[in-house]
Interface confidence: medium
């Protein structure tokens, strides 16, 4: 078993002989390079001292000395295998080979996890050169260890195109546990059954998991990481959490609120945006949604009339945009308006209603049974009608508004006239003899022209011609009465 | 098909321990807890214990603590109960149990049991 | 620790008929798992997390309740359903106790 900041197999000499395992202070190196971007200079060397046999890449030299012995295969030394340590703590370690001095273009590099470490890292490399061999340290240090270190570091030296890769130093950097996964905050059916995630890692492993509901536990005895609590349903809002045990101590996730969800609040600030004859433009603020989301809203119309049947209107929108225009009013009318919403569990109650009233229209009918004659002695048209129903007229009859058309051969003339509210009469002079004149009348109110009636149509004759009976607006189906006297 | 296989009938002598066990086949051995429970003739189950063995993680039912031990070797996809001191009390036929669900799931129910052991203690 | 009262202790049903068993907890209990023994035999799960039907136990067995109290239905009697039925509670607690059983015959 490995403990904390322990080695795995202690390291062997450095350098048997001569070089003994923990270097002496008169052994100054010749030279201490920062390895900053995997780069070592060229060297010369001398043979060098016989290590101990070895598990990684070997270069065997062709080249002989002058005495042609053969010279011994290259190998990095033996290290530590496996350093565990905890989080933010320092570490520092090597690789150490010894190189003939006949050797030259030697570089050393760094690789973590099969990518070479450039750029920023603490890494040095030192030589100590003797008379055939030259010593090189290569020195790996990080200040403060993160998970991101967690791995399997190697040395690479290439000589005359060999590659001597040393055996791996495996890093181990252990913590508190590490959430990957934390339970997350929902909105929930009351009573229903729902599931809650919570997933840490170290190292160390293994990872307990003990659920909390409301600060209290919820499983006394731990669950292995990842662990997924099915809550069978509840009845009121509950904060839940996860704790994370391993053999370093406890990490709590984040406590997620877990809401029931519930009818929403009735909207509040219903208000009046526009109002128009025959429209009312209302918006309102919503209510909390019951942690559900909105679907659709519901507006009440009802008649603020005591005297009308009470009978409610309704209008169905969507939720968005908290706007909707109320058609199909009577004009001149108050209204109550009352707005409710629903998300999937219900209606929420009505909001506060509120008092709103339509504007004057225009009269939405012409008056009735418009009737015209001829008056030849006093060489006028009587026009005589009924004003319309008063629910129709939208509004207060401020007048009427005539229209007569004079028509004769290549002549065509359209006259209006305008005449208080009080007349169901009216009398206009013969503007053309031996002519036709269509008459049409529209009621007026303050919010506007309402539309003419048929077209009635009366010959007028030639001076002389005997006075005889009236035009009148038409049965219905009858679309162009001409009366010819 | 999930399997438990338990090792056969064992008559022991008062005071004597003995070790019983169940091994599993045909899912992952090592990320489910092993739980074992106990059925005296003619009475209901108790609950003695489990044991996670991935890790040799055990929990106990407070009236087995002293009386079951529990291990498991990931090799051999087996787990183990050790019972001590033996009583007549302690005759019975025991049972592993694999936790159901998704090994994650924290609820507790068992989804496959083995046949049983029978254990009679007798002098 | 939790004790769950199963009822009745024994019970005897016609084929075809429905047949209803009960477990009491004295406590609630988050959910509760239904077992089928027969002489000789291991335990059987039958209901898992108070409603859910384990794998190839057939439709006429069905699991409800919550808080304190919990129900095995078993909607039409079959000769084969003679056995003794056991209910598991898992809750905030160990251990994860037993009923006493309730024993079911054939009439």
């Known amino acids: 078993a490995i403990t904390e900041a322990r080695e795995e197999a202690k390291p062997y000499p450095l350098f048997p002989g001569p070089f003994p395992g923990s270097l002496q202070t008169d052994h100054t190196p010749l030279l201490s390079l920062p390895h900053a971007s995997g780069y070592q200079p060229a060297l010369m060397f001398s043979p060098t001292q016989p290590g101990r046999p070895h598990t990684g890449n070997v270069a065997i030299p062709q080249v002989t000395s002058v005495e042609s012995k053969p010279l011994p295969p290259l190998a990095f030394k033996h290290t530590v295998g496996h350093i565990i340590l905890s989080e933010h703590k320092g570490v520092k370690f090597n690789c150490s080979i010894s190189v003939p001095n006949i050797y030259q273009d030697t570089t050393i590099s760094w690789w973590k996890d099969g990518k070479e470490l450039l750029g920023a890292h603490h890494a040095i490399t030192q030589f100590y050169p003797d008379d055939e061999v030259t010593a090189i340290i290569a020195s790996f240090s990080i200040t403060s260890v993160q998970r991101s270190d967690n791995g399997s570091y190697i040395c690479k030296m290439k000589i005359n195109n060999e590659e001597i890769v040393s055996d791996p130093i495996y890093i181990e950097v252990q913590g508190l546990p590490h959430f990957t996964k934390q339970p997350e905050s929902m909105n929930v059916t009351r009573n229903t059954a729902f599931n809650l995630t919570c997933q840490a890692v170290g190292p160390p492993e293994p990872v307990n998991i003990f659920w909390v509901q409301n600060s209290s536990r919820v499983n006394e005895q731990p669950e292995k990481s990842p662990s997924v609590l099915t809550v069978p349903g509840l009845t009121e809002m509950a904060v839940f959490s996860c704790e994370a045990h391993n053999d370093k101590g406890l990490t709590v996730s984040k406590g997620v609120q877990i809401n029931i969800k519930a009818i929403p609040s009735p909207p509040t600030e219903v208000s009046i945006r526009n109002s128009t004859a025959h429209s009312i433009l209302i918006s309102w603020v919503p209510g909390f949604d019951g942690y559900s989301p909105f679907r659709n809203c519901s507006i009440q119309v009802k008649e603020a009339d005591p005297l009308s049947n009470g009978s409610v209107m309704i209008f169905n929108t969507s939720a968005l945009p908290h706007l909707y225009q109320i058609k199909q009013l009577q004009a001149l009318a108050n209204y109550s308006i009352g707005v409710s919403c629903m998300n999937e569990i219900g209606w929420s109650a009505v909001s506060p209603w509120i008092l709103a009233s339509t504007t004057e229209g225009a009269p939405s009918v012409a008056p009735l049974n418009v009737t015209v004659f001829l008056n030849e002695s006093s060489d006028n048209v009587d026009i005589r009608w009924m004003k319309p129903p008063t629910k129709q007229q939208d509004g207060e009859l401020v007048g009427y508004r005539i229209s007569h058309v004079w028509q004769s051969a290549g002549i065509s003339k359209e006259l209006l006239e305008e005449v208080g509210q009080n007349g169901s009469r009216a009398r206009i002079s013969v503007q053309v003899h031996n002519a036709t004149c269509t008459v049409r009348i529209a009621a007026v109110t303050r919010g506007g022209v309402g539309p003419f009636s048929d077209p009635v149509k009366i010959f007028i004759p030639a001076h002389g011609w005997v006075d005889y009976a009236p035009s009148s607006t038409p049965a219905p189906g009858n679309a162009d009465p001409v009366l010819i006297i | 098909q999930v399997q438990l296989q338990q090792s056969g009938p064992e008559l022991v002598k008062p005071g004597a321990s003995v070790k019983i066990s169940c091994k599993a086949s045909?899912?992952?051995?090592?990320?489910?807890?092993m739980n074992w429970v106990k059925q005296r003739p003619g009475k209901g189950l108790e609950w003695i214990g489990r044991?996670?063995?991935?890790?040799?993680?055990?929990n106990y039912n407070g009236k087995f603590k002293g009386k079951a031990t529990l291990t498991a070797d990931k090799s051999s996809n087996t787990a183990y109960m050790q019972l001590n001191s033996l009583t007549s009390e302690d005759s019975a036929v025991y049972f592993c149990?694999?936790?159901?669900?998704?090994?994650?799931?924290?609820?507790?129910?068992?989804?496959?049991w083995g046949q049983g052991t029978t254990l009679t203690v007798s002098s | 620790q939790i004790v769950l009262t199963q009822s009745p202790a024994i019970m005897s049903a016609s084929p075809g008929v429905k047949v209803t068993m009960t477990c009491s907890a004295s406590?609630?209990?988050?959910?509760m798992h239904w077992y089928q023994q027969k002489p000789g035999s291991s335990p059987r799960l039958l209901i898992y997390?108070?409603?859910n039907l384990a794998s190839g136990v057939p439709v006429r067995f069905s699991g409800s309740g919550s808080g304190t109290s919990y129900s095995l239905t078993i909607s039409r009697m079959e000769a084969e359903d003679a056995a003794t039925y056991y209910c598991?509670?898992?809750?905030?607690?160990?251990?994860?106790?037993f009923g006493g059983g309730t024993k079911l015959e054939i009439k």
């Open positions: 149990a694999r936790k159901g669900g998704y090994y994650y799931s924290i609820s507790n129910y068992f989804d496959y």
């Open positions: 045909d899912y992952e051995f090592s990320r489910s807890w």
């Open positions: 044991i996670y063995p991935g890790d040799g993680d055990t």
């Open positions: 406590s609630s209990v988050s959910y």
């Open positions: 997390d108070t409603s």
């Open positions: 598991q509670q898992w809750s905030s607690y160990p251990p994860y106790t």
